[in-house]
């Protein structure tokens, strides 16, 4: 059956706007905003009035936005029963470009087109809307769901097989990329383990950390320079903090993750072939942590097997100081659980306005990083002196 | 029992950084569908939610998804 | 109500020729990629020839390649198979279908096409 | 071209069975798999999309799964108008291929 016109309009006001500026701003986050795209003239042109009221807005209260214009244009035709070409759609993006470098938003940046994954018609939708288009925005971006949270299982979520479909995904973006516009910078623009609002019981649970870490690392080792997850708080199941501002796993999984992980992305990979299991990546520690200093050494692991993996790092590291941080699930629910502890430790906020201490675990020089079953943690080597790092 | 069957032994790059990532490489968003809610205005005043972004700083926090194409913007509107 | 009608099924010689028509409404024609599927009596699917909106780009299964070819008009609303060099295997039932990125929405009824001497 | 194997090719079963049909992909399609239902004398119908997104107007007791290489088709409750041929689809890319179908009749 024709499914369009699922979507009825809605509007915003200046106080939305308001709320939303001000919690990015106050939260040290940069508020990238999505215009809609589905506003056009009989002969489907972008109308870029509603636009400019917003810009007009945001403008005169001197707010700082990036700019982003439509979400999935490859499913207008099943969300709206409207087709737009990426030729279309990239000289959309060339008008509201003009807007903007005559606004006070000169420098904004300009991000797009946020396709979904690419299927054969989305990767020709992003390949010449990048011909037309792709001057003028400042990175690439699509969208990436491993599983329908319908009918998403926990053994998909263990699940190496579905894990390394992301590998492939990644691959065609960048060989389309790389065929029109090189050098591009390319960012998952919203991304999460389960379409739909994420899969019900699993993906706000521990089990749900095994994708994010995965794909954070496979993110960083591929090129991707950005990832956004969809989404820090909101109706669903993929949200970082549930509805009552609680964090859940992969909150402290995140938070985990940029106090210990450096922008710079070095090479682990496992010896011999059992790889796909056990899952490894390497980084440069993040030196704002005041622990760490420049040349140390981050490694994150993900444990899929069903026994405890010990992880034997290579010459000249063997023998230096590693700090662990562990994760593993708290409570009778196991992997399914919401609550998740750090080293035996269960993270939860100390009040509305304290985050806990992240405590690692010293290990002694010399001994194997044990990683237990169905866990996943960071091990940072101290005083590795990577020059790559310094 | 003996660990030694399960001791995987790692390979390590270091020579030079394969790629460099945006200090805000570990991003967030907020789904549009969310300004459709009345409690918009109290749910982002939260100040343990700030809280835990701030935690996430730095990082782009993304305003959009599929409502992003049938929302429009009403300066009128109180 | 989206329909799509197909006609110009019959009987032909090994060899001869033969232009199926399909007639779409209930939706904007221009805005989808086209399809000709087909399905010999007995026999399971077999996707023949895909069609870009704009009829820029066409793509064939390789027995049909060379001797088939898709095209549409627009402003018409309609699809469109020559077959040319028709061989005894080509004998099926051919329908058209509105394609999707994730399958075929719509399908016609579908028109028989006999190759026999 | 990516070679689609269905199992089982025929199957029997009775009205409220629970019934399973599984589709092989010779290579990874990620999620890029359709389930249609044909009718003798009549044009296929889309049932699942995207492997497990049920298309609008089909009954909920049909669902799908799986990523990869390996899905199912799964019939929760058979009723008695379900008893027709299914086929597997692929469209990760061209040629687009189909299963060989799976027969379901009344036991």
């Known amino acids: 059956a024709d499914p369009g016109k699922k979507f009825k309009n809605s509007t915003y006001s200046r106080s939305s706007v308001d709320v939303l500026y001000t919690f990015a701003n106050c939260s040290g986050l940069d508020l990238i905003f999505g215009l809609n795209a589905l506003l056009r003239t009989a002969d489907l042109q972008w109308n870029s009035s509603n636009a400019q009221l917003l810009l007009d807005y945001c403008s005169s209260k001197g707010y700082n936005i990036s700019w982003e214009l439509g979400n999935e244009p490859n499913s207008f035709l099943k969300k709206a029963d409207i087709f737009i070409n990426g030729s279309q759609l990239g000289e959309d993006f060339i008008q509201l470009h003009k807007l903007l470098r005559k606004s006070t938003f000169k420098n904004a940046k300009l991000y797009g087109p946020d396709v979904g994954q690419p299927r054969r018609k989305t990767a020709k939708m992003l390949k010449s809307f990048l011909k037309a288009g792709g001057e003028v925005i400042d990175s690439v971006t699509w969208h990436h769901y491993y599983l329908n949270g319908r009918t998403a299982t926990k053994e998909d979520f263990l699940n190496p097989d579905v894990l390394d479909i992301f590998i492939s995904s990644v691959q065609k973006v960048f060989q389309v990329v790389e065929s029109t516009r090189p050098g591009k910078k390319v960012w998952l623009g919203e991304t999460s383990s389960a379409y739909g609002g994420g899969a019900p019981l699993l993906s706000d649970t521990f089990a749900a950390g095994f994708m994010w870490l995965d794909k954070l690392g496979l993110s960083a080792r591929m090129g991707i320079e950005v990832v956004m997850r969809q989404v820090f708080f909101g109706a669903g199941n993929y949200h970082l903090v549930d509805e009552n501002f609680d964090p859940l796993p992969d909150y402290w999984l995140s938070l985990l993750f940029k106090k210990l992980v450096g922008t710079k992305v070095l090479m682990a990979s496992v010896q011999g072939s059992k790889r796909r299991k056990l899952r490894v990546y390497l980084h440069c520690t993040n030196t704002d942590n005041p622990r760490y200093k420049e040349g140390d050494l981050t490694l994150y692991a993900i444990n899929l097997h069903n026994v405890t993996k010990y992880l034997r790092l290579p010459y000249p590291f063997s023998n230096k100081q590693v700090d662990k941080y562990l994760l593993r699930p708290l409570g009778p629910h196991g992997l399914l659980s919401k609550s998740v502890q750090l080293n035996g430790l269960t993270l939860k906020m100390v009040d509305d306005q304290t985050l806990p201490p992240l405590m690692e675990k010293p290990l002694r020089p010399g001994s194997s990083l044990g990683l237990p079953a169905f866990s996943y943690s960071f091990f940072v080597i101290r005083n590795a002196k990577v020059a790559a790092c310094i | 029992a003996d660990p030694g069957q399960d001791v995987v032994d790692l390979d390590f790059f270091t020579q030079e950084p394969l790629h460099l990532v945006s200090p805000s490489f570990l991003s967030v968003t907020i789904d549009a569908n969310l300004a459709t809610d009345p409690r918009f205005l109290i749910l982002l005043g939260s100040p343990k939610l700030r809280t835990l972004a701030r935690g996430l700083s730095p990082a782009y926090l993304r305003f959009g998804g599929t409502k992003t194409d049938f929302l429009i913007f009403d300066p009128k509107k109180e | 109500e989206v329909q799509l009608v197909e006609s110009g099924g019959g009987l032909v010689q090994p060899g001869g020729s033969l232009r199926l028509s399909c007639a779409a409404s209930g939706f904007t024609f221009s805005s989808y990629w086209m399809s000709w599927v087909r399905q010999a009596p007995g026999k399971g699917l077999e996707w023949v020839a895909s069609i870009y909106q704009d009829g820029s780009e066409k793509y064939y299964v390789d027995s049909v390649k060379g001797r088939f070819t898709i095209s549409r008009d627009n402003a018409k609303n309609s699809l469109y198979l020559q077959m040319n060099s028709l061989r005894a295997e080509d004998t099926a039932m051919y329908y058209c279908?509105?394609?999707?990125?994730?399958?075929?929405?719509?399908w016609g009824q579908g028109t028989l096409v006999t190759v026999s001497s | 071209a990516i070679q689609l194997t269905q199992s089982p090719s025929s199957l029997s079963a009775s009205v409220g069975d629970r019934v399973t049909i599984t589709c092989r992909a010779s290579q990874g399609i990620s999620s890029a798999l359709a389930w249609y239902q044909q009718k003798p004398g009549k044009a296929p119908k889309l049932l699942i999309y995207?492997?497990?997104s049920l298309e609008s107007g089909v009954p909920s007791r049909f669902s799908g799964s799986g990523s990869g290489t390996d899905f199912t088709l799964t019939i929760s409750s058979l009723q008695p108008e379900d008893f027709a041929t299914y086929y597997c689809q692929q469209f990760n890319s061209y040629p687009i291929t189909f299963g060989q179908g799976t027969r379901l009749e009344i036991k």
């Open positions: 995207d492997a497990s």
């Open positions: 279908a509105r394609e999707l990125d994730w399958g075929w929405d719509y």
